[in-house]
């Protein structure tokens, strides 16, 4: 069955199967280079 790949936090659709968080947090460190 189809799963919704990404919906933001103000949406009711599921993101569980998408592999992406519904509203990803900003990373707190920078990669070198």
């Amino acid at each position: 069955s189809e799963t919704t790949t990404g919906t933001s936090s103000n949406s009711s659709q599921s993101t569980s199967n998408s592999g992406l968080a519904p509203n990803p947090t900003n990373a707190t460190t920078k990669a070198a280079g």
């Epitope: 790949t5 919906t7 103000n10 949406s11 592999g19 519904p22 900003n26 460190t29 990669a31």
Partner: antibody, heavy 115, light 112 residues
Framework: EVKLEESGGGLVQPGGSMKLSCVVS????????MNWVRQSPEKGLEWVAQ??????????RFAESVKGRFTISRDDSKSDVYLQMNNLRTEDTGIYYC??????WGQGTTLTVSS | DVVMTQTPLTLSVTIGQPASISCKSS???????????LNWLLQRPGQSPKRLIY???NLDSGVPDRFTGSGSGTDFTLKISRVEAEDLGVYYC?????????FGGGTKLEIK
């Protein structure tokens, strides 16, 4: 069957522009965030851009390396997503994949930026 | 950015033998909803990436149960209980918890 098909790649000179397209079938396109990911021997797999849903006012996000140069858009009526790339650099060379996130991927289209 | 470090770089395995790949993140991938957005992809030669596992341990449809994902926080593992010829290719981890999304450098699985 879910299918994502990219087009629009090719050879372009540094400083030039190119527009990539991706047509999606087999899923409810308007319910899915869409992303572009690129792959190069130098940098491996690198997430490039994302566009969210109409309910999110089509919010967009970009990798720092392409901010101000690339724009992403979508046409829900056609199940299409686009990546407009301006002021291209040699380091933008790679295979560009259209993906719903991590689950569905297109076959990729190759962009070569070279003089 | 969250750095995803995969080891080993290359894995040479005899068919029927087990294999294990490690992926470590520079920050915890636990999201505020209690879920951990760590995925595993396989890119077979000449093909685009295909997802095998999402949310650390959930197998995608059609993925054989010889694949197992485990881990938490910053430390994750993909295990293949018995390697088959179709398993060759490059395995990548990708995190979807923090923006920007980042990939591991890949682990090439070769068949001995």
């Amino acid at each position: 069957e879910v299918k994502l098909e990219e087009s629009g790649g090719g050879l372009v000179q540094p400083g030039g522009s190119m527009k990539l397209s991706c047509v999606v079938s087999g899923l409810t396109f308007s319910n899915h965030w869409m992303n572009w990911v690129r792959q190069s021997p130098e940098k491996g797999l690198e997430w490039v851009a994302q566009i969210q849903l109409k309910s999110d006012n089509y919010a967009t996000r970009f990798a720092e390396s392409v901010k101000g140069r690339f724009t992403i858009s979508r046409d829900d009526s056609k199940s299409d997503v686009y990546l407009q790339m301006n002021n291209l650099r040699t380091e933008d060379t790679g295979i560009y994949y259209c993906t719903t996130g991590t689950d569905y991927w297109g076959q990729g289209t190759t962009l070569t930026v070279s003089s | 950015d969250v750095v995803m470090t995969q080891t080993p770089l290359t894995l040479s395995v005899t068919i029927g033998q087990p294999a294990s790949i490690s992926c470590k993140s520079s920050q915890s991938l636990l999201y505020s909803n209690g879920k951990t957005y760590l995925n595993w992809l396989l890119q077979r030669p000449g093909q685009s990436p295909k997802r095998l596992i999402y949310l650390v341990s959930n197998l995608d449809s059609g993925v054989p149960d010889r694949f197992t994902g485990s881990g938490s926080g910053t430390d994750f593992t993909l295990k293949i209980s018995r390697v088959e010829a179709e398993d060759l290719g490059v395995y990548y981890c990708i995190q979807g918890t923090h923006f920007p999304y980042t990939f591991g450098g890949g682990t090439k699985l070769e068949i001995k």
